[in-house]
Interface confidence: low
Amino acid sequence: TTPEPCELDDEDFRCVCNFSEPQPDWSEAFQCVSAVEVEIHAGGLNLEPFLKRVDADADPRQYADTVKALRVRRLTVGAAQVPAQLLVGALRVLAYSRLKELTLEDLKITGTMPPLPLEATGLALSSLRLRNVSWATGRSWLAELQQWLKPGLKVLSIAQAHSPAFSCEQVRAFPALTSLDLSDNPGLGERGLMAALCPHKFPAIQNLALRNTGMETPTGVCAALAAAGVQPHSLDLSHNSLRATVNPSAPRCMWSSALNSLNLSFAGLEQVPKGLPAKLRVLDLSCNRLNRAPQPDELPEVDNLTLDGNPFLVPGTALPHEGSMNSGVVPAC
């Protein structure tokens, strides 16, 4: 017997659907109506035929009362080829829901998104997370998606993007966005970061995550932030292969005084990098390759310094290098 595609937990909180059949019975998803957290994985299916069965242009207000009654707060949709028209139809209906966090992953969006009709209401999301989503419209995808959202978005996460740079002139400001996560875009690099951080479009950013994004030096990141007018309170540069030295010909960059927390863990650092902010509340240098304790003059003025998992803290550990057998156990790394 084939397993049921949808599973609802005992508390009616989380419902997960995995539609792997070539012609799935989508009505199975109705058992998720009582769930707060819903995940729908479509097994890589092309949802184009769906357009023939639904009227994507129908007035969604007819569904408003039904949709308002749904408990869903978090929705994840993954593994499908989705016509933009169908995505828009879903967003128009969900605008009447109490949905707060939408995650789209492993999707291929085909076609262009039509403009928001005058009478339509945007989706009041707090958090939008995209992972491995490709858009037929290239660099203008964010601007097209943004018009279907209300301006109150607080958290935006874009990972494994096929086009992490945006068409800045088309993007409107995100006035409420406090957290931007561009992690897991290894091809981004510092030049790409400059293109992605559209100047003055992210005025409220407090948290910026750039894990595994091909960043090379903290100074290069500083320059990109300064160019965009982005002044985060916390910056995560972990899981990048950072160089400790700065190009002598590169201009010195003044970090924003707003920055108080910097994560440089898992960055392959053999010494404390040059060009760090002069003062920080939190500096995380854990799980690097520091073979001696940093000298006070190498470090910023810092209240909370983390150095766990560096070779100098583990007796008898040599610096790991190609072909060496490193017998020392580095904690938590």
Partner: nanobody, 122 residues
Framework: QVQLQESGGGLVQSGGSLRLSCAVS????????MGWYRQAPGKGRELVAE??????NYADSVLGRFTISRDNAKNTVYLQMNSLKPEDTAVYYC?????????????????WGQGTQVTVSS
């Protein structure tokens, strides 16, 4: 750790009033929504009133009788309940949707209080 602490519940006669308070404590960058839910014996938890980005949302059964308000400086949300009816008897739960909490600044998070009992006698 983000926590919600409700207060103000109790026993009241039909037609009376109560004011519930819910204080949020912990490291928070941004409270997105705050609201009140209730659960009567043998029934599911239902939304009573919610404040979302400044807009209010009420259940039809309490419209005109209950008022939700928020003090941002104190990270507290209130529920003023007037003209109470026996069918309002329930455990009232405070709910907050947070971003930038101490758990992770990149995660939307839903937090619930322990609940406060409201009993309306006829």
């Amino acid at each position: 750790q983000v926590q919600l602490q409700e207060s103000g519940g109790g026993l009241v006669q039909s037609g009376g009033s109560l004011r519930l308070s819910c204080a949020v404590s912990g490291s928070i960058f941004s409270i997105v929504d705050m609201g009140w839910y209730r659960q009567a014996p043998g029934k599911g938890r239902e939304l009573v009133a919610e404040l979302s980005d400044g807009a209010t949302n009420y259940a039809d059964s309490v419209l005109g009788r209950f008022t939700i308000s928020r003090d941002n400086a104190k990270n507290t949300v209130y529920l003023q309940m007037n003209s109470l009816k026996p069918e309002d008897t329930a455990v009232y739960y405070c709910n907050a949707d947070l971003t930038g909490s101490s758990y992770s600044p990149y995660r939307y998070l839903e937090v619930w209080g322990q609940g406060t009992q409201v009993t309306v006698s006829s």
